[in-house]
């Protein structure tokens, strides 16, 4: 008889990414005997929760919990039953809940309580539901990208762990309600709040991170809409031939539009607004989102926020990817340089509604917003973060790495389950022939 080698036992972990516009569930898996290896944890499956983000259930907290049931049922299927009890389950909420917590902390608590109530009903090892800080969201996204791309440590053929020569990758995340930029830097931080020191696999990393609340794609679109209502009788970023009725209550209920909110307005009033396909006015409208007037540090990105010069290569994911991918794939426009990105944004903003629909059939939902989205991404990267043509050449727009979605969720789980040791693995792997 010969021994049949059984496949290594797998462990699983579940993270619910409760974003501002929707919630996604990610199930991760890894071989139980290789927990400390880098890049060994991968995505097993995922599930999109139907409906809006949990912050949209402020008036109906129970619904926030119940909305997760379908995906949790999928988790019961996707994770082998004998692993359920040992599978950690986390829920992390981001900027949508940060905003709700600012405006209505009681509702925010009620939503998290309801979600917790639902998650504790399941046989997984539930380890809490909480709101991540912007700093955590940025850093965990950076950890995810670099972990998946195996930038922290590498396993050499001689059986020794070594740190690869290539540096780490910066991470840029564009969510629904906030955007994050995170990268390794040698410059000491002039603002302590933006510096995070990490020790991973025995290596020390000094990381700059900042999260801009209200600069996520959905909130930017709301702010531009509020500005258009305030300054124009039309929306320069919407295509000509497109018009819709805007409910004022929807526009002004967000704390992000408070600056444009009239002193008195009828929240139930509907205002008709039409697009005008005006790239130049649209650019002006988007420019109004950034302030460069004062900087209390030696250098800033925008709004008086300290930022060292961008350094190294970057991965831009989530809505950065979706926006650029639309320009590249749906519109067939080149976006390899900043100049091309700007030209692509202008191209989209010049299109009429009929032209856009003909060009991109069957994508009605957000079609009218791609002009504003493209203008914002272009301005955020060039004027906001200070990418020049050379630095922009080092930016890759990608939503996945190693078949795993890039975002804060994996980094969060790796951190909370101690899957990234602070010190390098003590045991040698394999044989040293030297």
């Amino acid at each position: 008889t010969r021994d049949i080698r059984e496949p290594p036992a797998l462990k699983y972990g579940i993270v619910l990414d409760a974003g501002s516009s929707h919630t996604s569930m990610f199930i991760y898996k890894w071989p139980a005997d290789k927990e400390n290896d880098t890049g060994i944890v991968g995505q097993h499956s995922s599930c999109d929760v139907p409906g809006g983000g949990i912050s949209s259930y402020a008036d109906n907290p129970s619904g926030a919990g119940q909305s997760l049931v379908g995906c949790l049922e999928q988790a019961l299927r996707d994770v082998p039953k004998e692993r359920h009890a040992g599978t950690p389950l986390y829920l992390g909420a981001t900027a949508g809940m940060r905003l709700l917590n600012l405006t209505n902390p009681e509702a925010s608590t009620s939503v998290l309580t309801a979600v917790t109530h639902t998650l504790t009903q399941y046989p997984f090892d539930f380890r809490g539901a909480r709101i991540l800080s912007g700093q955590e969201e940025g850093v965990f996204g950076w950890v995810t990208a670099n972990y998946l791309l195996e930038n922290f440590i590498k396993y050499g053929w001689v059986g020794r762990w070594f740190r690869p020569r290539k540096g780490t990758l910066g991470a840029m995340d564009l969510g629904g309600a906030s955007t994050q930029i995170t990268f390794e830097t040698t410059s000491p931080a002039e603002d302590r709040a933006s510096e995070v020191q990490l020790r991973l696999y025995g290596q020390h990393y000094r990381v700059y991170t900042h999260s801009f609340l209200c600069y996520g794609r959905d909130q930017v679109l709301q702010r531009l809409l509020a500005s258009a209502l305030q300054t124009h009788s039309f929306h320069p970023c919407w295509p000509r031939g497109f018009s819709t009725h805007v409910l004022l209550g929807d526009v002004y209920q967000s704390p992000c539009t408070v600056a444009q909110r009239p002193q008195t307005f009828n929240s139930s009033a509907r205002v008709s607004l039409s697009g005008s396909s005006d790239p130049h006015l649209c650019r002006d409208l988007v420019s109004g989102l950034f302030s460069f007037s004062s900087c209390p540090f030696s250098r800033c990105s925008f709004n008086g926020v300290f930022q060292p010069p961008v350094a190294g290569n970057f991965i831009a994911f989530s809505a950065f990817f979706y926006t650029v991918n639309f320009l590249r794939t749906s519109m067939g426009l080149p976006v390899a340089t900043l100049q091309q990105l700007e030209a692509a944004a202008v191209n989209v903003c010049n299109q009429t509604w009929a032209q856009l629909q003909a060009r991109v059939p069957g994508q009605q939902a957000h079609l009218a917003d791609y002009c504003a989205g493209a203008m914002f991404v272009q301005q955020l990267l060039s004027r906001g973060y200070g990418f020049d043509e050379r630095a922009f050449g080092g930016v890759i727009f990608q939503k996945k790495a190693a078949d795993t979605a890039v975002g804060w969720a994996l980094g969060y789980m790796l951190n909370l389950t101690n899957l990234i040791p602070a010190d390098p693995p003590g045991l040698r792997k394999g044989t040293d022939f030297s």
Epitope: N60, S62, G63, G65, Q66, S67, V69, L72, E73, L76, R77, P80, K81, A114, H117, T118, L119, T120, Q121, Y122, P123
Partner: antibody, heavy 120, light 109 residues
């Protein structure tokens, strides 16, 4: 402690419909779903369908699809089960049962049931 | 469609151990729940998640589940345990609850 209270016994003619109510007393349907289970005389339990009251989300057993409608009125914490095109084999005790969102505690609160008799 | 099969009846001597089985295709991969129903009464949950007891259910009741068979075990059976017992499982594929046909437990002596 939440209790479920159902409407009284009904006698119906074949081909007609019956609507049974189930009210949560001492609490609401907050974070719970409500299932309807029936039991014909001397027979076993048979699941008919469920509703998540605050979402209005329903699921039905294939056998009853198109003949059963489950609704809920959140304001009164009452769930309803309506069964149409009644036939004699629908004579049964109809139970409403509360289930937690994750099925972890399955049906933890039941009412005593409503007897529906279908007879010409 | 998924089905659960139970023996029609099981007898046990007073004070002895009763075992009621519930078989279904790969039932060990699903969670099984057990209900006790006495004549003229609504069912009562006695076991959830294969082997967990809700508060108020005596320790004499236990459950196990693997392979194609789930088992409800009642040790030191008492006259008051005489009832119909139903196993149930949630069929995730079809999003529906499935009940076994029920087992009548008779306590002799």
């Amino acid at each position: 402690q939440v209790q479920l209270v159902q409407s009284g016994a009904e006698v119906k003619k074949p081909g007609s419909s019956v609507k049974v109510s189930c009210k949560a007393s001492g609490g609401t349907f907050d974070s719970y779903a409500v299932s309807w289970v029936r039991q014909a005389p001397g027979q076993g339990l048979e699941w008919m369908g469920r509703i998540v009251p605050w979402l209005g989300h329903t699921q039905y057993a294939q056998k009853f699809q198109g003949r059963v409608t489950i609704t809920a009125d959140e304001s009164t914490s009452t769930a309803y089960m309506e069964l149409s095109s009644l036939r004699s084999e629908d004579t049964a005790v109809y139970y409403c049962a509360r289930e937690s969102p994750g099925y972890r505690y399955s049906f933890d609160v039941w009412d005593q049931g409503t007897l529906v008799t279908v007879s010409s | 469609s998924y089905e659960l099969t139970q023996p029609l009846s099981v007898s046990v001597a007073l004070g002895q151990t009763a075992r009621i089985t519930c078989s279904g295709d790969a039932i060990g991969e699903k969670y099984v729940y057990w209900y006790q129903q006495k004549p003229g009464q609504a069912p009562v949950l006695v076991i959830y998640d294969d082997n967990n007891r809700p508060s108020g259910i005596p320790e004499r009741f236990s459950g196990s589940n693997s392979g194609n068979t789930a088992t409800l075990t009642i040790s030191r059976a008492q006259a008051g345990d005489e009832a119909d017992y139903y196993c149930a499982s949630y069929d995730l594929q079809q999003a529906r609850w499935v009940f076994g046909g029920g087992t009548k437990l008779t306590v002799l002596g």
